[in-house]
């Protein structure tokens, strides 16, 4: 039976790597079998030499060398962009057009945005070598070399972020010549070599100077979550402080923070975090729904200065970011017992004030919900007839109910003395398993 063309396999975006040909695939159905033709930036390809394109019998387009770039359709386009390919499949009943596939060529420019600079660091202190790689397509990755060899990154001591190399604690062995290398499929580029010298801390002068430092912690502000970090990031705050006293002897600043305990209670131990700033910095990894105390401490080498004043900040509660665990349904005498385990502590996002339990529609229970207050983690529901019972449970903080658990179901049979809950001993029934059983 005759049918109009339909594209089955669309061409995909590709990077022209060379030296071999690039292939663009296009497959179509239809009766009579459709003929395939290709277009580049909306213009049909001639396929006649010296055109570098060649059509295979199965409709695949071979590109033997990059096409000459015509006029850019989007202003002064990048030289990476070779154009957009589409395929058309036609028979006497009509024409189908594929999605566009962009062909680009790998490029790595030569100019670094930021070159690493020579520097002197102090044993035990942090230091940063900055590097901004050249523009490249695909986007280049950055690696660091020391004294002509790839730098072996040690977790907790080395961090590469946005191209820059952060050394948490300088050691004498870190002395040497560093180079940032940008790499992509077009090749690699080396930055200038930066000489890093490591000095021993001069402790004999620093403590006296540091004792005279005064730090005023002025502001602690809750930061808006970065959308790139997903829907439920841990909270972070921005600390701002002012330094007075001798001419900036501190080489680094540390945040000290702890959760506030009830008045008169034993204070929690202070956690410490090295700050990446001299007047303000971000501090992350906190927990929602907690009251925090913050202070800042200056240091230089092994010497520490006096702590700043303490500022308090209450982080708002959020809804729990994980459901209750191990939800089970057990039959009772004319009742069904629902029990569960609270979500993991790191997902509480505040104080769990109770739980919400829902029965799902299309079962023997009408749609309903119950609220369980406090720390109780079970609920007894009266049952009046045989059939299926399905529930979901969610933890509740001051901000509301969090993520609900997956539905768990229980099938009560006629006589009510036998209840099926564990098909082939694989745990509670899911709604899907139950539907399948009821269909059978």
């Amino acid at each position: 039976q005759d049918s109009p063309p339909q594209i089955l396999v669309h061409p995909q975006d590709q990077l022209f790597q060379g030296p071999g040909p690039a292939r663009m695939s296009c497959q179509a159905s239809g009766q009579p079998p459709p003929t395939i033709r290709w277009l580049l930036n909306g213009q049909p390809l001639s396929m006649v030499p010296p055109d570098p394109h060649h059509l295979l019998p199965d409709g695949t387009l071979l590109l033997l060398q990059p096409p000459a770039r015509g006029h850019a359709h989007d202003g002064q386009a990048l030289s990476t962009d070779l154009g957009v390919y589409t395929c058309e499949a036609s028979n006497r009943l009509g024409t189908a057009v594929s999605r566009g596939a962009r062909l680009s060529v790998a490029v790595l420019r030569e100019d670094f945005q930021i070159q690493p600079r020579d520097m002197v660091a102090v044993v035990g202190e942090q230091f940063t070598l900055e590097c901004g790689p050249p523009w490249g397509h695909p986007e280049p990755t950055v690696s660091w070399w020391k004294d002509g060899k790839p730098l072996a990154l040690q977790p907790g001591r080395h961090t590469v972020s946005g191209g820059s190399l952060l050394m948490a604690r300088a050691e004498k062995s870190d002395e040497g010549t560093y180079m940032c290398v940008a790499t992509n499929s077009a090749g690699h580029r080396e930055s200038r070599a930066a000489r890093v010298s490591i000095q021993e801390p001069q402790d004999y002068t620093e403590p006296v100077e540091l004792l005279a430092v005064r730090i005023q912690l002025e502001n602690v502000t809750l930061l808006n979550p970065d959308p790139a970090e997903g829907p439920k990031p841990r909270p972070a705050v921005w600390l701002s402080w002012k330094v007075s006293g001798p001419a900036a002897p501190a080489q680094s600043y540390t945040a000290l923070f702890r959760t506030q305990t009830a008045p008169g209670g034993q204070g929690a131990p202070w956690a410490e975090e090295l700050l990446a700033g001299w007047q303000s910095a971000e501090l992350g990894g906190l927990h929602w729904g907690q009251d925090y105390e913050f202070k800042v401490r200056p240091s230089s080498g092994r010497a520490r200065g006096p702590d700043s004043n303490v500022l308090l900040l209450r982080l708002p509660e959020k809804v729990p970011s994980a459901p209750p665990q191990e939800v089970t349904l057990k039959p009772g005498n004319g009742t069904v017992f629902v029990s569960w385990v609270p979500p993991p502590a790191e997902n509480h996002n505040g104080i769990i004030r109770g739980y919400q339990v829902w029965s799902l529609g299309n079962t023997s229970l009408p749609p309903a919900n119950w609220t369980v207050v406090g720390e109780q983690t079970q609920l007894e529901i009266a049952t009046h007839m045989p059939g299926s019972y399905c529930v979901q449970v969610a933890a509740v903080t001051g901000a509301g109910a969090g993520e609900p658990s997956r539905p768990v179901c229980l099938l009560l049979e006629q006589a009510m003395e036998r209840a099926t809950q564990e098909p082939s001993e694989h745990g509670p029934w899911t709604l899907e398993q139950l539907r399948a059983t009821l269909k059978r």
Epitope: D74, G75, L78, P134, W135, H137, G163, R192, A228
Partner: antibody, heavy 118, light 112 residues
Framework: EVQLVESGGGLVQPGGSLRLSCAAS????????MSWVRQAPGKGLEWVAT????????YYPDSVKGRFTISRDNAKNTLYLQMNSLRAEDTAVYYC???????????WGQGTLVTVSS | DIVMTQSPLSLPVTLGEPASISCRSS???????????LNWYLQKPGQSPQLLIY???NRFSGVPDRFSGSGSGTDFTLKISRVEAEDVGVYYC?????????FGPGTKVDIK
């Protein structure tokens, strides 16, 4: 036709936060680096931030470093500027602009006004 | 940071006459690879800036050929061979050789 449309500007108190967006169309957003440039009322232009096409590399002047964060969502063809700890001197029209490599800003949006005042 | 200065800061011009704007940088804009990234923009009244010249002397697409750029090292010039009424506005130079990128203070061009 290349189009850049900024949004999210408005009045905010000192110390507050604001997030600007720039919706891009008419070009393959994911292959271009992007920048924010601002202009205080009656004053000249000041570069604020640049982000590489994949979002891995970001650059700022000292005047905003640590307070502003440039980011992008290539799936949504959108550029962002998260501005925290705002000060009166951040009051300006904020433009987003497309970069050719890291060589020059070729197309600019119409701008969005941010006013920081108590 | 590199400081960009422009002169004059105000330039009254006569229609049909030539005009010239100077831009100076506090240090050379030539990088390790001998590349130079100096661009010129025009901001017409009530509009966004528009690119005129990129990389010292390259005219952007659609820019009339009465605009030309030249210079090297620390001294750069934008020339308009015959000023037209639509050329009024503020002209800015911008260096993107070294981070942080910096603009000149602008030269206001208006008709005498």
């Amino acid at each position: 036709e290349v189009q850049l449309v900024e949004s999210g500007g408005g009045l905010v108190q000192p110390g507050g936060s604001l997030r600007l967006s720039c919706a891009a169309s008419g070009f393959t957003f994911s292959t271009y680096a992007m920048s924010w440039v601002r202009q205080a009322p009656g004053k000249g232009l000041e570069w604020v931030a640049t982000i590489s096409q994949g979002g891995t590399y970001t650059y700022y002047p000292d005047s905003v470093k640590g307070r502003f964060t440039i980011s992008r969502d290539n799936a949504k063809n959108t550029l962002y500027l998260q501005m925290n700890s705002l000060r009166a001197e951040d009051t300006a029209v904020y433009y987003c602009a497309r970069l050719i490599y890291y060589d020059y800003l070729d197309y600019w949006g119409q701008g969005t006004l941010v006013t920081v005042s108590s | 940071d590199i400081v960009m200065t422009q002169s004059p800061l105000s330039l009254p011009v006569t229609l049909g006459e030539p005009a010239s704007i100077s831009c100076r940088s506090s240090q050379s804009l030539e990088n390790e690879n001998k590349n130079l990234y100096l661009n010129w923009y025009l901001q017409k009244p009530g509009q966004s800036p528009q690119l005129l010249i990129y990389r010292v002397s390259n005219r952007f697409s659609g820019v009339p050929d009465r605009f030309s750029g030249s210079g090297s090292g620390t001294d750069f010039t934008l020339k308009i061979s015959r000023v037209e009424a639509e050329d009024v506005g503020v002209y800015y130079c911008l260096q993107v050789t070294h981070v942080p990128w910096t603009f000149g203070p602008g030269t206001k061009v208006d008709i005498k």
